[in-house]
C-alpha cells in the first residue's frame, strides 16, 4: 500500500497586503484516517492556523469541503492578508488518537506579503539656517515588504547625492522601515525651493511615492539695511528712509532711535512678496531739524526672526 504523502506544491507564495492567500495541500491517501491541521512555523511554539476538527478561524476558509468523506484537498484560503501573516505554513496530517498523533508534515510554503510603504514623511531642521549653511532633511516610510526599496532625494528636480539611508530591521521581519537623511546647502534663492524624497518599491508598480518639504521652513535670509536722507523740505523737516530688503521670513520688527532714544517701533505685516520669495520693507522717519541744536544720530534697528538686532545709523547735519 502506498505510503501517505502530504504535498505542498508551492515552496513560496507572494501576496499583496489586503488580498487573499491560497495555500495548497493535498494528501496522497485517505488513510490512516485523521485530521489535517495548518501551522505557521515549527516546533513547540508553532501557531495553529486552521484545524478541520475544531476552533474558530474567521479568516481561514478550506478550499474544499472538509466534511466530505473522500476529500484529499486540504488547501486553505486566508483572507485580508497583512504583513504579520508572513511566515512558513505547514500542512500537517494527524492520525486519530487520544489525543490525535502527528503523522506527516508537508514541506512548507513560505508566505511573503507585499506591503506598500507608507507615504514618505519629510521633516526639516528644528531651527532655521542661513545661506551657505548645510541643513538636514529626514525622510521616513514604514510598513513595506519585501525589504528591497529605492530612495532618492531631489532639490528642485535635481537629484541629490549627499544622503544616508537605513532600512530596518537588518534581519528578517514581517515589514520594514526606511529612514534617510539628506544634507542640503542653502542659498539665498532657496525660499521657493523644495526637497523631494522619492520611494520606489515593487508594490508601487513603477509609480513611486513622494514626500516633500519646503526650504522656506528651513531657511532664514537676513535683510540688507540702507538708511538714506531725502532733501530737506521747506518746513525744516528731513525725511530719512530705512530700506530693509531681501529678507525671509516676514517676521521683522523695526525700531527708530534718535540719539539712542526709541522714537518709533513698527512690525512688518502683509508685505508683498518678491519673485524669489523674499520681502522688502521701507520705513520713513521725519526729523524736525529746527528742534535740534546739534547733529541728530538716527539709527534704524532691525530685529529679524528673533535674531540679534542689526543697526544702521545715519547722522542728520544741523547747520549753525
Amino acid at each position: 500500500e502506498e505510503e501517505l504523502q502530504v504535498i505542498q506544491p508551492e515552496k513560496s507564495v507572494s501576496v499583496a497586503a489586503g488580498e487573499s492567500a491560497t495555500l495548497n495541500c493535498t494528501a496522497t491517501s485517505l488513510i490512516p484516517v485523521g485530521p489535517i491541521q495548518w501551522f505557521r512555523g515549527v516546533g513547540p511554539g508553532r501557531e495553529l492556523i486552521y484545524s478541520q476538527k475544531e476552533g474558530h478561524f474567521p479568516r481561514v476558509t478550506p478550499v474544499s469541503d472538509p466534511t466530505k468523506r473522500n476529500n484529499m484537498d486540504f488547501s486553505i484560503r486566508i483572507s485580508n492578508i497583512t504583513p504579520a501573516d508572513a511566515g512558513t505554513y505547514y500542512c500537517v496530517k494527524f492520525r486519530k488518537g487520544s489525543p490525535d498523533v502527528e503523522l506527516k508534515s508537508g514541506a512548507g510554503t513560505e508566505l511573503s506579503v507585499r506591503a506598500k510603504p507608507s507615504a514618505p514623511v519629510v521633516s526639516g531642521p528644528a531651527v532655521r539656517a542661513t545661506a551657505e549653511h548645510t541643513v538636514s532633511f529626514t525622510c521616513e516610510s514604514h510598513g513595506f515588504s519585501p525589504r528591497d526599496i529605492t530612495l532618492k532625494w531631489f532639490k528642485n528636480g535635481n537629484e541629490l547625492s549627499d544622503f544616508q539611508t537605513n532600512v530596518d530591521p537588518a534581519g528578517k521581519s514581517v515589514s520594514y522601515s526606511i529612514r534617510s537623511t539628506a544634507r542640503v546647502v542653502l542659498t539665498r534663492r532657496d525660499v521657493h525651493s523644495q526637497v523631494i524624497c522619492e520611494v520606489a518599491h515593487v508594490t508601487l508598480q513603477g509609480d513611486p511615492l513622494r514626500g516633500t518639504a519646503n526650504l522656506s521652513e528651513a531657511i532664514r535670509v537676513p535683510p540688507f539695511l540702507e538708511v538714506t536722507q531725502q532733501s530737506m523740505r521747506a518746513d525744516n523737516q528731513v525725511n530719512v528712509t530705512c530700506q530693509v530688503t531681501k529678507f525671509y521670513p516676514q517676521r521683522l520688527q523695526l525700531t527708530w532711535l534718535e540719539n539712542g532714544n526709541v522714537s518709533r517701533t513698527e512690525m512688518a505685516s502683509a508685505l508683498p512678496e518678491n519673485k524669489d520669495g523674499t520681502y522688502n520693507w521701507t520705513s520713513w522717519l521725519l526729523v524736525n531739524v529746527s528742534a535740534h541744536r546739534d547733529d541728530v544720530k538716527l539709527t534704524c534697528q532691525v530685529e529679524h526672526d528673533g535674531q540679534p538686532a542689526v543697526n544702521k545709523s545715519f547722522s542728520v547735519k544741523v547747520s549753525a
Partner: antibody, heavy 120, light 107 residues
C-alpha cells in the same frame, strides 16, 4: 468485499469474562479505528470505547473503565473486545464498527453483532 | 459528557409523508453529527455524516441539516422500507454518545 465479521453468540455466567472478535477484510485495517457499541434488549445504542488499529491507542467509556480491554492484531486484521466481571445488565448485542471520519467519529461499516447473554 | 436528546421518541406516519426528527446536543459539536437507521435484528446503518453529507448508497430522500447544537433528519417522502428506528450520534469528542432513538411506525 469490505466487511467486519464478528465471532458467534456467547452465554456467560455472572463474574466471567467474554472476548469478542471482529475480523476486517476488503480494506486497509491499519488505516481506521474500531469502536465497540452495545445494545441491550429493547434499548438504544451505547458506545463502549475506541481503538486505533494503527497505533493501538484506546479510549474507553467511563462506566466500563477497568472492566474492558480493546486490542487489535494487525497481522490478522482483527479487533478484540474483552469484558470482565460480567453482570446481568451486560446482556446485549455487541457490535464492532469502523470509524471513518477524518476529523470526527462516525461509523460507516458495522459487524452483524454478537449476542452476549449473562445468566446464572 | 455531551448528552444527545432526540425527539420525538416515536412517530406514526404513512407512506409518502414527510418526517422530521430532531436531535439536540448539550453543547456545541460543530457539524460532527451522524444519523443511523436500524431495523430489528440488524446492525445500524449510516445515513448521514457530518450533519448534512449523504453516505454513499443512501437514497436522496434522506437529508440532514444543522450545526452547533440543533440538528434535523428529514425523510422527504416516507417509503415502506423506511419504517425503522433512527439514532443520532455526536462524533466531536470522546465519549461518543448516541441519542435515545426515534421509532418511525406505520400509522
Amino acid at each position: 468485499q469490505v466487511q467486519l465479521v464478528q465471532s458467534g453468540a456467547e452465554v456467560k455466567k455472572p463474574g466471567a469474562s467474554v472476548k469478542v472478535s471482529c475480523k476486517a477484510s476488503g480494506y486497509t485495517f491499519g488505516g481506521y479505528g474500531i469502536s465497540w457499541v452495545r445494545q441491550a434488549p429493547g434499548q438504544g445504542l451505547e458506545w463502549m470505547g475506541w481503538i486505533s488499529a494503527y497505533g493501538g491507542e484506546t479510549n474507553y467509556a467511563q462506566k466500563l473503565q477497568g472492566r474492558v480491554t480493546m486490542t487489535t492484531d494487525t497481522s490478522t486484521s482483527t479487533a478484540y473486545m474483552e469484558l470482565r466481571s460480567l453482570r446481568s445488565d451486560d446482556t446485549a448485542v455487541y457490535y464492532c464498527a469502523r470509524e471513518a471520519g477524518s476529523s470526527w467519529y462516525d461509523f460507516d461499516l458495522w459487524g452483524r453483532g454478537t449476542l452476549v447473554t449473562v445468566s446464572s | 459528557d455531551i448528552q444527545m436528546t432526540q425527539s420525538p421518541s416515536s412517530v406514526s406516519a404513512s407512506v409518502g409523508d414527510r418526517v422530521t426528527i430532531t436531535c439536540r446536543a448539550s453543547q456545541g459539536i460543530s457539524s460532527w453529527l451522524a444519523w443511523y437507521q436500524q431495523k430489528p435484528g440488524k446492525a445500524p446503518k449510516l445515513l448521514i455524516y457530518a450533519a448534512s453529507n449523504l453516505q454513499s448508497g443512501v437514497p436522496s430522500r434522506f437529508s440532514g441539516s444543522g450545526s452547533g447544537t440543533d440538528f434535523t433528519l428529514t425523510i422527504s417522502s416516507l417509503q415502506p422500507e423506511d419504517f425503522a428506528t433512527y439514532y443520532c450520534q455526536q462524533g466531536a469528542s470522546f465519549p461518543i454518545t448516541f441519542g435515545g432513538g426515534t421509532k418511525v411506525e406505520i400509522k
